[in-house]
């Protein structure tokens, strides 16, 4: 429970509690920002990001962005608040336990993005179509 000696600031989105008043720990995500990648034409790829960070806010989820243009391929791994757009797109799959890539329309490049809410879930990015249907067997296991 948030102890009484912990001040509550006026707009404190750092504190997220459940019904018991326990304080929620944020997500753990791969967080390498933008890096060059060799991931191409594969069903899934590992991020090859060695940095796992505690997200700044408890409501943030893990995000991965794969981009390919005439010159290179990059993979971006970050934390982001799903209430806010990222690269002008809504994180519609933020509750998913797996990072399943979906193509987005961006002129001049191929652009895929995924978001997910289990720890380090943006380490394994999935392009395969077979994952793109909702699977009731995928249990959301967070932090256990």
């Amino acid at each position: 429970t948030i102890p009484p000696h912990v001040q509550k600031s006026v707009n404190n989105d750092m504190i997220v509690t459940d019904n018991n008043g326990a304080v929620k720990f944020p997500q753990l995500c791969k967080f390498c920002d933008v890096r060059f990648s060799t991931c191409d034409n594969q069903k899934s790829c590992m991020s090859n990001c060695s940095i796992t960070s505690i997200c700044e806010k408890p409501q943030e989820v893990c995000v991965a962005v794969w981009r390919k243009n005439d010159e290179n391929i990059t993979l971006e791994t970050v934390c982001h608040d799903p209430k806010l757009p990222y690269h002008d797109f809504i994180l519609e799959d933020a509750a998913s336990p797996k990072c399943i890539m979906k193509e987005k329309k961006k002129p001049g490049e191929t652009f895929f993005m995924c978001s997910c809410s289990s720890d380090e879930c943006n380490d394994n990015i999935i392009f395969s179509e077979e994952y793109n249907t909702s699977n009731p067997d995928l249990l959301l296991v967070i932090f256990q």
């Epitope: 429970t1 459940d18 326990a22 304080v23 929620k24 720990f25 408890p58 967070i142 932090f143 256990q144």
Partner: nanobody, 119 residues
Framework: EVQLLESGGGLVQPGGSLRLSCAAS????????MAWVRQAPGKGLEWVSL????????YYANSVKGRFTISRDNSKNTLYLQMNSLRAEDTAVYYC????????????WGQGTLVTVSS
């Protein structure tokens, strides 16, 4: 009764170091994840670092990565935070927190220890 008692805070110059300790009692310390959390004056809580029961893995916020090191001594029921290369923005009350064992919940907190980084 669960108790967490932090110590080691104080006034330090920018670039200096401090080591915080958190003495735990009232629960089986070596079975629980532990964390350090801080609150700067007038600001919200910021999760600083997390450590698993056997000491690995450990995780850090981007703001402290490479400068702070979390560790624990399960034989002494004590959690530590070694803070190096301190900056003015590290000024805050530092709390240790105990994992509840469920979901993402941390259920017990200490009273906190104040770290002031100023020249």
């Amino acid at each position: 009764e669960v108790q967490l008692l932090e110590s080691g805070g104080g006034l330090v110059q920018p670039g200096g170091s401090l080591r915080l300790s958190c003495a735990a009692s009232g629960f089986t310390f070596d079975k629980y994840k532990m964390a350090w959390v801080r609150q700067a004056p007038g600001k919200g809580l910021e999760w600083v670092s997390l450590i698993f029961p056997n000491g690995v893995p450990t995780y850090y916020a981007n703001s402290v990565k490479g400068r702070f090191t979390i560790s624990r001594d399960n034989s002494k029921n004590t959690l530590y935070l070694q803070m190096n290369s301190l900056r003015a923005e590290d000024t805050a009350v530092y709390y240790c927190a105990k994992y509840s064992g469920q979901g993402r919940d941390f259920d017990y907190w200490g009273q906190g220890t104040l770290v002031t980084v100023s020249s």
